[in-house]
């Protein structure tokens, strides 16, 4: 999916209002400084691509993030503010339902959510930079 045409301001507002709190609750006191940031992004569409990948694509060490509250809210936000996003996700959701596993918060999942927090920070920081840039023109 190409995130170029998303409403980035609305996505930022949703993140700050709800998604961030759910991510932090998932971390359960684990601090962002406990892990090194290994995933990055360069612009807003790229950040959303990385956020989607890390949130919804199961990895061998952390398979179940897509069922977490922050993931559900991320999915709803992207569906709401990215034109055509929900249509691209129908098949992926059906495939995911078949792979349900019991919920275990592993250290690798905490590390992955820490990376997500970093990606969201980059997303909003690039947004602020853009707004600041336009403001001066």
């Amino acid at each position: 999916y190409d995130f170029t045409n998303c409403d980035f301001q609305k996505i930022e507002a949703d993140y700050l209002r709800t998604i961030s709190k759910d991510l932090i609750t998932y971390m359960s006191g684990t601090k962002s400084t406990d892990f090194n940031n290994t995933v990055s992004c360069s612009n807003r569409p790229h950040c959303l691509t990385e956020i989607q990948s890390l949130t919804f694509n199961p990895t061998p060490r952390c398979a179940s993030l897509a069922k977490e509250m922050f993931a559900r809210k991320t999915k709803a936000t992207l569906a709401l503010w990215c034109p055509g996003y929900s249509e691209t996700q129908i098949n992926a959701t059906q495939a995911m339902k078949k792979r349900r596993k019991r919920k275990v918060t592993t250290n690798k999942c905490l590390e992955q959510v820490s990376q997500l927090l970093g990606l969201w920070r980059r997303f909003i920081r690039t947004l602020l930079k853009k707004q600041h840039h336009h403001h001066h023109h």
Partner: antibody, heavy 123, light 112 residues
Framework: QVQLQESGPGLVKPSGTLSLTCAVS?????????WNWVRQPPGKGLQWIGE???????NYNPSLKSRVTISVDMSKNQFSLKLSSVTAADTAVYFC????????????????WGQGILVTVSS | DIVMTQSPLSLPVTPGEPASISCRSS???????????LDWYLQKPGQSPQLLIY???DRASGVPDRFSGSGSGTDFTLKISRVEAEDVGIYYC?????????FGQGTKLEIK
């Protein structure tokens, strides 16, 4: 408005145990905050003692670790500090403080503090 | 433990004039997320400390914009653009990169 209030005895005998409580109002002790203790000997600087999360996870200053216990009482919305085998060097104003995360999971900034309680270690 | 060193330890300032406090850490406070985990606190006489700056340069809620933080890695500065009488007290830097959190010795700002 978030408020923190320290309470406990102002005088403790040498080799005894210092026990303090921090009552939290305007916020839940079970929210995603770390709850901290910091002390300040008279006329000196600040020293971080340790912190607790509502799950019971703790981090202590290694220089005090063998003598410190921090616990949380969710039913009373408060957390406590116990410091054993005290000496005159433990005489200080003891502060409790909240460490609340920002929107990206960063911790390490104490945005609310109690007013502090002076504890004197003397016989 | 990370050692924090402040200078000067005493700072007499004329009201309306700028002031600058330096803080150095024994190791870098720059995390891989590109943020510096350094705070500045002000302890006014007879009061508990109050947060001024966090993450090196972010002003805490309600802090006047005459206060600013800068620096990266091991060298940090707190600047007050125009000192006011209410700014007197002891300023502390604190590293928040890792526990144990550690404070500088403090800089006492007084009015000339």
């Amino acid at each position: 408005q978030v408020q923190l209030q320290e309470s406990g005895p102002g005088l403790v005998k040498p080799s005894g145990t210092l026990s303090l409580t921090c009552a939290v109002s305007g916020d839940s002790i079970s929210s995603d905050n770390w709850w901290n203790w910091v002390r300040q000997p008279p006329g000196k600087g600040l020293q971080w003692i340790g912190e607790i999360f509502h799950s019971g996870r703790t981090n202590y200053n290694p220089s005090l670790k063998s003598r410190v216990t921090i616990s949380v009482d969710m039913s009373k919305n408060q957390f406590s500090l116990k410091l054993s085998s005290v000496t005159a060097a433990d005489t200080a104003v003891y502060f409790c403080a909240r460490d609340a995360p920002n929107d990206y999971g960063d911790y390490g900034f104490f945005d609310y503090w109690g007013q502090g309680i002076l504890v004197t270690v003397s016989s | 433990d990370i050692v924090m060193t402040q200078s000067p330890l005493s700072l007499p300032v004329t009201p309306g004039e700028p002031a600058s406090i330096s803080c150095r850490s024994s190791q870098s406070l720059l995390h891989s997320n590109e943020y510096n985990y350094l705070d500045w606190y002000l302890q006014k006489p007879g009061q508990s400390p109050q947060l001024l700056i966090y993450l090196g340069s972010d002003r805490a809620s309600g802090v006047p914009d005459r206060f600013s933080g800068s620096g990266s890695g091991t060298d940090f500065t707190l600047k007050i653009s125009r000192v006011e009488a209410e700014d007197v007290g002891i300023y502390y830097c604190m590293q928040a990169l890792q526990t144990p959190y550690t404070f500088g010795q403090g800089t006492k700002l007084e009015i000339k």
